[in-house]
């Protein structure tokens, strides 16, 4: 099928970075400046994304791949391919429609994005509170109260590695 298609359609021979130019007898022409084609056989090149304003360029556009944007300091990416930049807040705060607000007592946010969340209720999971929560940190739950018999060694919580929201999609 592929061989038949290429015999019938000269455009299928045009590689990425070019387009099949109908105005020039279906010759493969290079993509004009600020445009790209990431696959072969395309009849047009796509306009490169421009990273402006709060967006900054993470990867320049080439003839075969689109530009990639991220956000300027003080903002973080949201959406597929960083389609939006949202304002950072401090840990211990959440971004509301009126700006950054401190977490209420009993809630925390250990990120620069997202909401303030209630502290974990250790007793609901049959455990006891080992370390109290703050605006910036959830409580740390330890062994169940029954396990805390005299002579039992206390548990040192491991240092957090990467929290939700800090890993690539």
């Amino acid at each position: 099928f592929e061989r038949t298609r290429s015999l019938q359609d000269p455009c299928s021979n045009c590689p990425a970075g070019t387009f099949c130019d109908n105005n020039r007898n279906q010759i493969c022409s290079p993509c004009p400046p600020n445009s790209f084609s990431s696959a072969g056989g395309q009849r047009t090149c796509d306009i490169c994304r421009q990273c402006k304003g709060v967006f900054r360029t993470r990867k320049e556009c080439s003839s075969t791949s689109n530009a990639e944007c991220d956000c300027t300091p003080g903002f973080h990416c949201l959406g597929a391919g960083c389609s939006m930049c949202e304002q950072d807040c401090k840990q211990g705060q959440e971004l509301t429609k009126k700006g950054c607000k401190d977490c209420c007592f009993g809630t925390f946010n250990d990120q620069k994005r997202g909401i303030c969340r209630p502290w974990t209720n250790c007793s609901l999971d049959g455990k006891s509170v080992l370390v109290n929560g703050t605006k910036e940190r959830d409580v740390v739950c330890g062994p169940s109260p029954a396990d805390l018999s005299p002579g039992a060694s206390s548990v040192t919580p491991p240092a957090p590695a990467r929290e939700p929201g800090h890993s690539p999609q």
């Epitope: 949201l78 990120q111 209630p118 929290e163 939700p164 929201g165 890993s167 690539p168 999609q169």
Partner: antibody
């Protein structure tokens, strides 16, 4: 490709417990909160709770507190939901759902569901 | 506890615009997410943070939120849009879903 695959259907007697698993693949399991939502036959969606896969921290809907336990095994990239003291009204499809990058409780990827009868 | 009210059903002719509402006290101050659920399938996020669209969701889907009402708008409705639609918010310590709206394409 990112997906959440849940364990198979279960039939339980009243008073028993059920434990449903949700295996994540195609993304960093520890980086995203995992939620559980259920749907009784012909009814709407009902949120049960979440787990932070990094810390194990949880939050449960008041309705289920004392009956539900949500845990995770980071080495297996799997979240679990255990519901105890089952009654007929607990017959439902149980879904796990990943919270998105905005971390505003938007559930951007769902498992296929597990029917518990 | 916080309550979200949706109309049980909405009917629309193909090619027309469907509007599904979600009512709640001062809902405009909250972030609203919308899900589409087709029979026998898991829900799919179609709008988040009031009006943002996940990748893969057509531009025909849009959202707005102010006062006491959030609205999901589906323009140029197609037969494939027939489904149940749920709104969702976060209120203090709980995720709350609306009762759902069945969209029928006539």
């Amino acid at each position: 490709q990112m997906q959440l695959v849940q364990s198979g259907a279960e039939v339980k007697k009243p008073g028993a417990s059920v434990k449903v698993s949700c295996k994540a693949s195609g993304y960093s399991f520890s980086g995203y909160y995992m939620h559980w939502v259920r749907q009784a036959p012909g009814q709407g969606l009902e949120w049960m709770g979440w787990v932070n896969p990094m810390s194990g921290g949880t939050n449960y809907a008041q309705k289920f507190q004392g009956r539900v336990t949500i845990t995770r095994d980071t080495s297996a990239s799997t979240a679990y939901m255990e519901l105890s003291s089952l009654r007929s009204e607990d017959t439902a499809v149980y879904y796990c759902a990943r919270e998105g990058m905005a971390m505003r409780l938007e559930l951007d990827k769902w498992g296929q569901g597990t029917l518990v009868t | 506890s916080y309550e979200l009210t949706q109309p049980p059903s909405v009917s629309v002719a193909p090619g027309k615009t469907a509007r599904i509402t979600c009512g709640g006290n001062n809902i405009g101050s909250k972030s609203v997410h919308w899900y589409q659920q087709k029979p026998g399938q898991a829900p799919v996020l179609v709008i988040y943070y009031d009006s943002d669209r996940p990748s893969g969701i057509p531009e025909r889907f849009s959202g707005s939120n102010s006062g006491n009402t959030a609205t999901l708008t589906i323009s140029r409705v197609e037969a494939g849009d027939e489904a149940d639609y749920y709104c969702q918010v976060w209120d203090s310590s709980s995720v709350v879903f609306g009762g759902g709206t069945q969209l029928t394409v006539l």
